[in-house]
């Protein structure tokens, strides 16, 4: 058993039929010595008396809020949560496996630049009685500070018969050095509690590996005189790290005809312009990627040829 936060404890259980469970001793937080009784949740049934209560925790019916009283007055509470281990593996019932970029990916994180700011998100089908707490650091043995905000519900989607809820959190490395070579990874830890079930999820990454620039901005077409061609130009996104001479991007320019069956033409360029033959109903799209490190491409910025 360990303390998650004040008056909230996690009991780690090997979860299999007829498992013996864990013996837990609860102590009432009071100077009083006698006349103390214990109850569980809203029940008025007295479970025991005395300053301590010894219980065998085997299943979710044994978890919950234990309260010690004296003469009708509440003295203290202890909330017991269960963390299940099945076949040596901690349960992952609360969050959905996103399966990207690989199986057992519960947390996904992205950064728009090298400032040390990043966003993580996760998915669940659970809508109520759900809380999350997020902690982060750079490195684990001698951790350097990363400050995370509160996790918030950021999207709801219908997936077949189920509703899916996306939660996200923003974190900022306290003393980020954008130009430095990273040697220690960022660690992100999410505590998830659903009713009386506790689970924890972790992710470890370098900022350079989770970079995904915003799409190029100001994608514009300028017709060229006496020609079917247009000059396509774009700019670095505002959120990208500066100076751009050091934090450089490369771009993918794609021209797609009106029919999806028509062959796309695409090129890669370090420049911020190109010349395109603009056919009716075609569209021109541009996306960005870090020039020197192959992390994710941005989403496309697109403009119609018309």
């Amino acid at each position: 058993i360990w303390e998650l936060k004040k008056d909230v404890y996690v009991v780690e259980l090997d979860w299999y039929p007829d498992a013996p469970g864990e013996m837990v001793v609860l102590t009432c937080d009071t100077p009083e010595e006698d006349g103390i009784t214990w109850t569980l949740d809203q029940s008025s049934e007295v479970l025991g008396s005395g300053k301590t209560l010894t219980i065998q925790v085997k299943e979710f019916g044994d978890a919950g809020q234990y309260t010690c009283h004296k003469g009708g007055e509440v003295l203290s509470h202890s909330l017991l949560l269960l963390h299940k281990k099945e076949d040596g593996i901690w349960s992952t019932d609360i969050l959905k496996d996103q399966k990207e970029p690989k199986n057992k990916t519960f947390l996904r994180c992205e950064a728009k630049n090298y400032s040390g700011r990043f966003t993580c998100w996760w998915l669940t089908t659970i809508s109520t009685d759900l809380t999350f707490s997020v902690k982060s650091s750079r490195g684990s043995s001698d951790p350097q500070g990363v400050t995370c905000g509160a996790a918030t519900l950021s999207a709801e989607r219908v997936r077949g018969d189920n509703k899916e809820y996306e939660y996200s959190v923003e974190c900022q490395e306290d003393s980020a050095c954008p130009a430095a070579e990273e040697s220690l990874p960022i660690e992100v830890m999410v505590d998830a509690v659903h009713k009386l079930k506790y689970e924890n999820y972790t992710s470890s990454f370098f900022i350079r590996d989770i970079i995904k620039p915003d799409p190029p901005k100001n994608l514009q077409l300028k017709p060229l005189k006496n020609s079917r061609q247009v000059e396509v130009s774009w700019e670095y996104p505002d959120t990208w790290s500066t100076p751009h001479s050091y934090f450089s991007l490369t771009f993918c320019v794609q021209v797609q005809g009106k029919s999806k069956r028509e062959k796309k033409d695409r090129v890669f360029t370090d420049k911020t312009s190109a010349t395109v033959i603009c056919r009716k109903n075609a569209s021109i799209s541009v996306r960005a990627q870090d020039r020197y490190y192959s992390s994710s491409w941005s989403e496309w910025a697109s403009v119609p040829c018309s």
């Epitope: 061609q229 021209v255 033409d265 090129v267 890669f268 190109a274 010349t275 395109v276 033959i277």
Partner: nanobody, 124 residues
Framework: EVQLVESGGGLVQAGGSLRPSCAAS????????MGWFRQAPGKERESVAT????????DYADSVKGRFTISRDNAKNTVYLQMDSLKPEDTAVYYC???????WGRGPDEYDTWGQGTQVTVSS
């Protein structure tokens, strides 16, 4: 792999035009981005113009924008460089180059197949 042979260079007066061409052998020509590069005596090889696989996307060096036009005919396995309003500083050996997926703007190292070059001389 494609093999490249340039032709159509020559001597021309300033203000005149030339249209060198580059013939590629091999059935996979339309899988390649094509580029024209040039090298003047004592100078580094520089990009002049590049064209995408279908010919829809092109790019030009600032020094030739509005004067040169790159085009290709995938049925004939040929890429062209229409050179108008020629200047003495355009004098160089012009090379045709091919690459499947080069990053434009990074120069000659992105290209793995080269022609032997054709001389363009612009007299004043």
């Amino acid at each position: 792999e494609v093999q490249l042979v340039e032709s159509g260079g020559g001597l021309v007066q300033a203000g005149g035009s030339l249209r060198p061409s580059c013939a590629a052998s091999g059935r996979t020509f339309s899988n390649y981005n094509m580029g024209w590069f040039r090298q003047a005596p004592g100078k580094e090889r520089e990009s002049v113009a590049t064209i995408s696989r279908s010919g829809v996307i092109t790019d030009y060096a600032d020094s030739v924008k509005g004067r040169f036009t790159i085009s290709r005919d995938n049925a004939k396995n040929t890429v062209y460089l229409q050179m108008d309003s020629l200047k003495p500083e355009d004098t160089a050996v012009y090379y045709c180059a091919a690459a499947r997926s080069p990053v434009w703007g990074r120069g000659p190292d992105e290209y793995d197949t080269w022609g032997q070059g054709t001389q363009v001389t612009v007299s004043s």
